[in-house]
Interface confidence: low
């Protein structure tokens, strides 16, 4: 039975050219996290594997940095980075938990962080 929940940074915005940290946190479960995948739409950004460590997709290695923790830092943001991001927690024995973050990259200097929210 999957009892865990994923808390994410929710809907966030950032300025073009800046950077942003994508964070997810898995709670309310004792399951072991074996791997975390970070994905944007239909592209894989990075993997953090419990045994093998981090691997950044070659397409993003210049603009994506691992961490902090199991999070992901996106740098040199462009308006094309606007969209959905997913953290996929592979756990044992629970299975797969998915969290969603929506990032809006703004041309202006007005960029506010949205509220945190939970995905059951």
């Amino acid at each position: 039975m999957m009892t865990g929940t994923i808390e994410t940074t929710g809907n966030i915005s950032a300025e073009k050219g800046g950077s942003i940290i994508l964070q997810c946190h898995l709670s309310s479960t004792t399951a072991q996290v074996t791997q975390v995948n970070w994905e944007q739409q239909d592209q894989l950004l990075a993997i953090c594997n419990a045994d093998l460590g981090w691997h950044i997709s070659p397409s993003f290695k210049d603009r994506v940095a691992p961490g902090p923790g199991l999070g992901l830092t996106l740098q040199s943001l462009t308006v094309n980075d606007t969209g959905e991001y997913f953290c996929i927690y592979h756990t044992y024995p629970d299975g797969t938990y998915t969290g969603r973050i929506f990032l809006e990259v703004l041309e202006s200097s007005v960029a506010e962080h949205g509220a945190r929210f939970q995905i059951p």
Epitope: T34, Q35, N37, E39, Q41, D42, Q43, L44, I47, N49, L52, H55, S57, F86, I88, H90, G95, T96, T98
Partner: nanobody, 128 residues
Framework: QVQLAESGGGSVQTGGSLRLSCAAS????????VAWFRQAPGKEREGVAR????????YYADSVKGRFIISQDNAKNTVYLQMNTLKPEDTAMYYC?????????????????????WGQGTQVTVSS
């Protein structure tokens, strides 16, 4: 455990077609993350195409887009790779692989290091 068996490889002329099959047995679920990889002599293994079985979501490497089609037959627990307009550079050993804990989407290539189950491979040779 999951067992994978590829078939359908062979020799073909440039511009020809082949259909590879990857039959899965064992503890398979409705949501499977299956990919085709290939490795040519002296080159690194590369991802060709992947399929998430429950959603039908597909992903292709740029080198095969528009020429290769990945599909499935759920009743037979089989994933296919239809390869059209083959080129000499498609010559390689082709492997199917399955990820143990499938992700929502995306193409996990990275030489296949994160895939848990592998078949023995089937050879494809394209001559000019």
């Amino acid at each position: 455990q999951v067992q994978l068996a590829e078939s359908g490889g062979g020799s073909v002329q440039t511009g020809g077609s082949l259909r590879l099959s990857c039959a899965a047995s064992g503890n398979t679920g409705s949501r499977r993350y299956v990919a085709w990889f290939r490795q040519a002599p002296g080159k690194e293994r590369e991802g060709v195409a992947r399929l998430i079985t429950d959603s039908g979501s597909t992903y292709y490497a740029d080198s095969v887009k528009g020429r290769f089609i990945i599909s499935q037959d759920n009743a037979k627990n089989t994933v296919y790779l239809q390869m059209n307009t083959l080129k000499p550079e498609d010559t390689a050993m082709y492997y199917c692989a399955e990820e143990l804990a499938p992700a929502r989407s995306g193409g996990i290539w990275f030489g296949g290091r994160y895939f848990s189950y592998w078949g023995q491979g089937t050879q494809v040779t394209v001559s000019s």
